[in-house]
């Protein structure tokens, strides 16, 4: 997290806000609900209280405007700048302005007013942008899904550094951003994508370029807004410029940023039995056109060319790949080796000699 220079903050805990005008995109009650919920994000974790005024001067004046709207920080039409807010202080201090050339919504369409407002009110209270891609105060808008919003830990640490904790946090689970060099790090899925490596963990993925050591961290939804926050397995089919992503009983085919029509499909359409609830890992072999799908202690082999499951499967993981354990969290193939991830460990397995040649920490893939 980051606070503003000179640690700008309010010297009182009871703050007022006023909605000066409304967007035509939403009903008045939807707008009021979004702002109320956005303030609650911050009051839940601090001693701050927010009271709405219907007229007069409030600490935080909220308005919608377009282009030049009276503060010499003009908006720019659709997309680009969405909103801005001033840090704590007199006059403009604390005020939040929303660009009415955007389409504001209470859903995933357009820009979600609650999410943008919660971010802006962070500025109104003294938080600057965070470098943590998982933080609400990260400067890039990402719709995080319909489920109950949980303020990320980085934002909690930031706001509590200014105002301290509240009496009781009604939602004490604050998601942490994974640390790539945590020795206990386990991974959810790994796939190549157009020459890069994508390494998934929780609602994030690291993107690793072959010529770089520093992996860049992204929210999965910043790349693919329609995908679930977390995924179970992934593999690339390079000759078709597609990657396949699995979550629960569903899977998606993606071309770059775009989901192919007809997806998601059910994993049973691949020929998996109905009792298989999820795929834990998947890896594709371009030279044979085969894909290994792991679930529980079993492995299936799918023929991507003929779109059928190979006979003689499923088989036990321990029988086909002795020594790697009886489950696979994530897997990928490179230069004749399969890399199996099981908890905080990865096994380098030679396809040619059919044996484990190295055992390494899982996060050595991230150069830790």
């Amino acid at each position: 997290y980051n606070v503003f220079p000179r640690t700008l903050k309010w010297s009182k805990m009871n703050l007022t806000y006023r909605i000066v005008n409304y967007t035509p995109d939403m009903t008045h009650s939807e707008v009021e609900k979004a702002f109320k919920k956005a303030f609650k994000v911050w009051s839940d974790v601090t001693p701050l209280n927010f009271t709405r005024l219907h007229d007069g001067i409030a600490d935080i004046m909220i308005s919608f405007g377009i282009k030049e709207h009276g503060d010499f920080y003009p908006f720019d039409g659709p997309s680009g700048l969405l909103a801005h807010a001033f840090p704590p202080g007199p006059n403009y201090g604390g005020d939040a302005h929303f660009d009415d050339d955007e389409t504001w919504t209470s859903s995933s369409k357009g820009y979600n007013l609650f999410l943008v407002a919660a971010h802006e009110f962070g500025h109104s209270l003294g938080l600057d942008h965070s470098k943590d891609p998982g933080a609400l105060m990260f400067p890039i808008y990402t719709y995080t899904g319909k489920s109950h919003f949980m303020l990320p830990d980085d934002d909690v640490q930031g706001i509590q550094s200014l105002y301290g904790p509240g009496d009781e946090d009604p939602n004490p689970k604050h998601p942490k951003t994974p640390d790539k060099c945590d020795p206990s790090l386990s991974l959810d899925a790994i796939t190549s994508l157009r020459g890069e490596t994508m390494i998934f963990k929780d609602r994030f993925f690291w993107r690793l370029h072959p010529q770089q050591v520093d992996a860049e961290l992204f929210l999965t939804k910043s790349f693919w807004p329609e995908l679930p926050n977390r995924i179970d397995a992934a593999y690339e089919h390079p000759s078709h410029d597609l990657i396949f992503i699995f979550r629960g009983r569903k899977f998606w085919a993606l071309n770059g940023y775009d989901i192919l029509e007809g997806y998601p499909k059910k994993i049973s359409e691949l020929g998996l039995p109905k009792e298989v609830k999820k795929i834990s890992a998947a890896v594709h072999f371009e030279d044979t056109g085969k894909t290994l799908l792991f679930s529980g202690n079993q492995v299936w082999r799918y023929d991507d060319t003929n779109h059928i499951m190979d006979k003689d499967y499923p088989r036990l993981i321990e029988e086909d790949f002795p020594g790697i354990g009886d489950k696979v969290d994530a897997v990928y193939e490179k230069n004749g080796y399969i890399y199996f991830f099981n908890g905080p460990i990865q096994f380098e397995y030679s396809i040619w000699s059919n044996r484990i040649v190295r055992v390494m920490p899982a996060n050595s893939i991230l150069w830790c």
């Epitope: 659709p78 790349f223 807004p225 940023y257 775009d258």
Partner: nanobody, 114 residues
Framework: EVQLVESGGGSVQTGGSLRLSCAAS????????MNWYRQAPGKQREFVAG???????NYAVSVKGRFTISRDNAEGTGYLQMNSLKPEDTAVYYC????????WGLGTQVTVSS
Amino acid sequence: EVQLVESGGGSVQTGGSLRLSCAASGSTFSRRSMNWYRQAPGKQREFVAGISTGRITNYAVSVKGRFTISRDNAEGTGYLQMNSLKPEDTAVYYCNAGGLQGYWGLGTQVTVSS
């Protein structure tokens, strides 16, 4: 319906630069990914660069650091700035909106000579 028209192709020496443009007609351009693909004679069409609706970029390993993709939703235009061009960059470059199942331009020829 989105129509795409590429421009900016041409001939250039090794190490030179070109800027390709992709003009889109149709109001849904801003809601689709914007990509550049290329096809060299006798080869398959290959991905070059892409930019999401949220302006997150993705490059083929062979062009990363040399090519820059950008978009202007208000103008309905996409761009590909190509620097340090190599003879192996010679191809017809196609603009795409929305991925493989989306919309395609007719292409613009880029020739890099040594």
